[in-house]
Interface confidence: low
């Protein structure tokens, strides 16, 4: 129903705390360079205004749209052009163009320093002094680095953060209590970020229909006992929620997500038998829990998929009468039978089925033509299964760091023109798939591996779009989202690449590397590895291993030396010479 004042409506629905958090996230995602204090001031002004509208919905400006209200606030920031350049031009436009313009200026890779966690004592002190400000800083810092982070989910992670600090700051050894717990939250939040970015990419590039297909497949896997009408309703609602969040309408998004969670909990009987424990939780935890709830038990009695979609004499008639509905039921029926497949694979199969019907239903004898369609799925299914097996075997053999290095070599050979920091970031993220997925039971590996890889490769594509340098990457990123991962996997050494000259300074290291945390040390070594491959794209695995082992030995020796600086300055050049020789 229409409300006289949209801002009053959302304030009432969400409550002050969530309202303020979401407005802060929205501003931080739009204007990523502003300080926390600048945004906090705007948030307070918006909140005060919302309260006046709650008191009197007819008060001045209360009838304005949220985009108008928020956009006017952002455009009133002093020095907008100096700090944000052409983003300031957005302020010359009217809504809805102004908001679209803001969205287009979101930066997926802002030049902000990494979000450093303060040491435990300092963190606990500032948390105790002002928990609200502390959590505000967290929302601001994460949101501006991840401008498409799913806002209601970020509120959930802030709540987790808050609970961890409350618990650990009361303990004697704060550090050992905080570190593993906060690391866990950080890891989950980073995965959540790339997954949501993929959803927004799907929405932005291919529209709501593409996202809805993704949602139908995912929901059908999770809720195989729900009927098609129920799945369609949930997919439609979920599409609306995600469209709103991807579009910057964070208050509507969070409100609608809460409504969807409420609906699911009120209709458990027709959705799934696994929802009760989620539904017993408070709002943020409930919605988060529902989003990753375990799959319901599959019905024991599902008939063969062939009955309705291959053997039925009416296949072409049913398809012609309502293409989207017929393909939707195919996707639903296939997905509910295959919780062991990735959503990407299910969408590829649905696409193959659609293409087959398009071709066959125009022929003289359609059943003879489409009769083998299910058999034609086989190679599409085998390819990701082989990918999982090969990569998980390699991960088990090498461990996470070694597996990342193997991927780094592979991807540097596929796209040597891509910047080394991007290649290292991508390989480190892709390499985490081993730890994340290869330890799972067999039937959960494929969906975990492929859907995670797809999300990481989506980020590679987004970063590459800003400065396209590799035809290989452009080719894979231009196709449909579900074809990207197979496209990247199929890439081989880029034969068009002219190897980089060998520069000694690229492989020259100093004693400061010894004091770096393990993660930073790994990044330094992986940077060197990528540069080696760029110098010798056809180097064998054996040659690269020799060089990297030598390099590791060199670091170990010099970092243990009494006079580290002398060791680095004398042994460094020797290492460089040995590297050149090994790769000659």
């Amino acid at each position: 129903e229409a409300h006289k004042s949209e801002i009053a409506h959302r304030y009432n629905d969400l409550g002050e705390q969530h309202f303020k958090g979401l407005v802060l996230i929205a501003f931080s995602q739009y204007l990523q360079k502003c300080s926390y204090d600048e945004h906090a001031k705007l948030v307070q002004e918006v909140t005060d205004f919302a309260k006046t509208c709650v008191a009197d919905e007819s008060a001045a400006n209360c009838d304005k749209s949220l985009h108008t209200l928020f956009g006017d606030k952002l455009c009133a920031i002093p020095n907008l052009r100096e700090n944000y350049g052409e983003l300031a031009d957005c302020c010359t436009k009217q809504e809805p163009e102004r908001n679209e313009c803001f969205l287009q200026h979101k930066d997926d890779n802002p030049s902000l320093p990494p979000f450093e966690r303060p040491e435990a004592e300092a963190m606990c002190t500032s948390f105790k002094e002002n928990p609200t400000t502390f959590m505000g800083h967290y929302l601001h810092e994460v949101a501006r680095r991840h401008p498409y982070f799913y806002a209601p989910e970020l509120l959930y992670y802030a709540e987790q953060y808050n609970e961890i600090l409350t618990q650990c700051c009361a303990e004697a050894d704060k550090e050992s209590c905080l570190t593993p717990k906060l690391d866990g939250v950080k890891e989950k939040a980073l995965v959540s970020s790339v997954r949501q970015r993929m959803k927004c990419s799907s929405m932005q590039k291919f529209g709501e229909r593409a996202f809805k297909a993704w949602a139908v497949a995912r929901l059908s896997q999770t809720f195989p006992n729900a009927d098609f009408a129920e799945i369609t309703k949930l997919a439609t609602d979920l599409t609306k929620v995600n469209k709103e969040c991807c579009h910057g309408d964070l208050l509507e998004c969070a409100d609608d997500r809460a409504e969807l969670a409420k609906y699911m909990c009120e209709n458990q009987a027709t959705i799934s038998s696994k929802l009760q424990t989620c539904c017993d939780k408070p709002l943020l935890k409930k919605a988060h829990c529902l989003s990753e709830v375990e799959h319901d038990t599959m019905p024991a009695d599902l008939p063969a998929i062939a009955a309705d979609f291959v053997e039925d004499q009416e296949v072409c008639k049913n398809y012609a009468e309502a293409k989207d509905v017929f393909l939707g039921t195919f996707l639903y029926e296939y997905s509910r039978r295959h919780p062991d497949y990735s959503v990407s694979l299910l969408l590829r199969l649905a696409k193959k089925y659609e293409a087959t019907l398009e071709k066959c239903c125009a022929e003289a004898n359609p059943p003879a033509c489409y009769g083998t369609v299910l058999a034609e799925f086989q190679p599409l299914v085998e390819e990701p299964k082989n990918l999982v097996k090969t990569n998980c075997d390699l991960y088990e053999k090498l461990g996470e760091y070694g597996f990342q290095n193997a991927i780094l070599v592979r991807y540097t050979q596929k796209a040597p023109q891509v910047s080394t920091p991007t290649l290292v970031e991508a390989a480190r993220n892709l390499g985490r798939v081993g730890t994340k997925c290869c330890t799972l039971p067999e039937d959960q590996r494929l969906p975990c591996v492929e859907d995670y890889l797809s999300a990481i490769l989506n980020r590679v594509c987004l970063l590459h779009e800003k400065t396209p340098v590799s035809e290989h990457v452009t080719k894979c990123c231009s196709g449909s989202l579900v074809e990207r991962r197979p496209c990247f996997s199929a890439l081989t050494v880029d034969e068009t690449y002219v190897p980089k000259e060998f520069k000694a300074e690229t492989f020259t290291f100093h004693s400061d590397i010894c004091t770096l945390p393990e993660k930073e040390k790994q990044i330094k070594k992986q940077t060197a590895l990528a540069e080696l491959v760029k110098h010798k794209p056809k180097a064998t695995a054996e040659q690269l291993k020799t060089v990297m082992d030598d390099f590791a030995q060199f670091l170990d020796t010099c970092c243990k030396a009494a006079d580290k600086d002398t060791c680095f300055s004398t042994e460094g050049p020797n290492l460089v010479t040995r590297c050149k020789d090994a790769l000659a």
């Epitope: 019905p299 024991a300 599902l302 009955a307």
Partner: nanobody, 115 residues
Framework: QVQLVESGGGLVQPGGSLRLSCAAS????????MSWVRQAPGKGPEWVSA????????RYAESVKGRFTISRDNAKKTLYLQMNSLKPEDTAVYYC????????GSQGTQVTVSS
């Protein structure tokens, strides 16, 4: 060509027992859940019982719970329904189906419970 052939029906007194069999061919029997469905004279089909592909998960209509037992032998490609404590209202044509469909794909076998 998918074929399902039921057998084992007959005339039995109330309280008696029967064991129905369904021989399957033309499809990978061991990959599919199976059901028993019945149709009494002048009535629509009624789902009776289902079993998953491996035989671990079984389900029954309320009207037969505790009296009927569904089972399968994948090696023999055969589905069974053991019916004990039969009642006159169990009188119907019984047929087996792939999945939990109530659409008839076979001739069925007549079960009559009468004194």
């Amino acid at each position: 060509q998918v074929q399902l052939v039921e057998s084992g029906g007959g005339l039995v007194q109330p309280g008696g027992s029967l064991r129905l069999s369904c021989a399957a061919s033309g499809f990978t029997f061991g990959s599919f859940g199976m059901s028993w469905v019945r149709q009494a004279p002048g009535k629509g089909p009624e789902w009776v019982s289902a079993i998953d592909s491996g035989g671990a998960d079984t389900r029954y209509a309320e009207s037969v719970k505790g009296r009927f037992t569904i089972s399968r032998d994948n090696a023999k490609k055969t589905l069974y329904l053991q019916m004990n404590s039969l009642k006159p209202e169990d009188t119907a044509v019984y047929y087996c189906t792939i999945g939990q469909s109530t659409s008839r794909g076979s001739q069925g076998t007549q079960v009559t419970v009468s004194s």
